[in-house]
Amino acid sequence: CDLPQTHSLGNRRALILLAQMRRISPFSCLKDRHDFEFPQEEFDDKQFQKAQAISVLHEMIQQTFNLFSTKDSSAALDETLLDEFYIELDQQLNDLESCVMQEVGVIESPLMYEDSILAVRKYFQRITLYLTEKKYSSCAWEVVRAEIMRSFSLSINLQKRLKSKE
């Protein structure tokens, strides 16, 4: 499956929007750093089938969308930027859904990749729990924003590797 050229542009725009969502100086938030245990092994494509990688990427973007579309994120972050961010993520989800259909078809089911998808979901559960424990403080959002930028960058790298394998 060939992701459209606009897909990689959308990735870059999403990262820029995340960077622009900064509300306070991160220098004051060092003590709030946290290990969210990013599921790195799910983004190492050594033994990945393409369909599995696409399913994991789809879950990653879906969970990012869910995280940033809560009332707490709306209260903490710039709404105009959030709206633009939703549009970019929505487009990426559509692109990946088309790919999943082409790659998986009727032969394989996304349930085959349940463990990988579950690992991504648990990662986002840890992020949500952290925000709750920190009472959605400004610094907690800064830490989460930095974490999502990092995981988003790793997702983009996986997409690049998939493209280079074509």
């Epitope: 960077a19 991160p26 938030c29």
Partner: antibody
């Protein structure tokens, strides 16, 4: 391979200005902060300040606030440390080092080779 | 500012010795404590981060422990290449601060 390459040694006179550099390569320059550390002859390490190259936000140690300026040019993956008027007491080795910011990763995991600044009349 | 105090400031030891260096913070810093090794004329090298995590490529004879205000760097069996100065550093809050250093010399 991650590398931080600093500019060469400098010999200056008191009152002169100076700008030294630290060029990052082998990683995404805007994904890490760059810190500057001073080491005076025979002494320990002193943290001077830090910059987030993604937006050039800076923070300084109170001891160095107003004495130096930290800047960055992300288009060429380079951070800078500058003085507008050097003093003999600025004679030291200056190191840059990368910091993961708010991400859970090792602090100051890569360092530049150091720039020796000598200020003497 | 958070003050970091290392002890001893210097020590003499022999190859094969077990060496312990301590670092105390003036207030609780959780586990945001790093250890560096510096040899003359060279840049510092990260050994331990987040109090007890061994940096990639660092020999397993180096270990770190502690949390809150009291931290320890241990070299289980001192090797000839370990003779150097060691610094602790807190990254709990700005300004980042270093200990004054501990010089490990040959007995």
């Amino acid at each position: 391979e991650v590398q931080l390459v600093q500019s060469g040694a400098e010999v200056k006179k008191p009152g002169e200005s100076l700008k030294i550099s630290c060029k990052g390569s082998g990683y995404s320059f805007t994904s890490y902060w760059i810190g500057w550390v001073r080491q005076m002859p025979g002494k320990g390490l002193e943290w001077m300040g830090i910059i987030d190259p993604s937006d050039s936000d800076t923070a300084y140690s109170p001891s160095f606030q107003g004495q130096v300026t930290i800047s960055a040019d992300k288009s060429i993956s380079t951070a800078y440390l500058q003085w507008s008027s050097l003093k003999a007491s600025d004679t030291a080795m200056y190191y840059c080092a990368r910091h993961p910011g708010l991400n859970w990763a090792p602090d100051f995991d890569y360092w530049g080779q150091g720039t020796l600044v000598t200020v003497s009349s | 500012d958070i003050q970091m105090t290392q002890s001893p400031s210097s020590l003499s030891a022999s190859v094969g010795d077990r060496v312990t260096i301590t670092c105390r913070a003036s207030q609780s810093i959780g586990g945001f404590l790093n250890w560096y090794q510096q040899k003359p004329g060279k840049a510092p090298k990260l050994l331990i981060y987040f109090a007890s995590s061994l940096q990639s490529g660092v020999p397993s004879r180096f270990s770190g422990s502690g949390s809150g205000t009291d931290f320890t760097l241990t070299i289980s069996s001192l090797q000839p290449e370990d003779f150097a100065t060691y610094y602790c550093q807190q990254s709990y809050s700005l300004p980042i601060t270093f200990g004054q250093g501990t010089k490990v010399e040959i007995k």
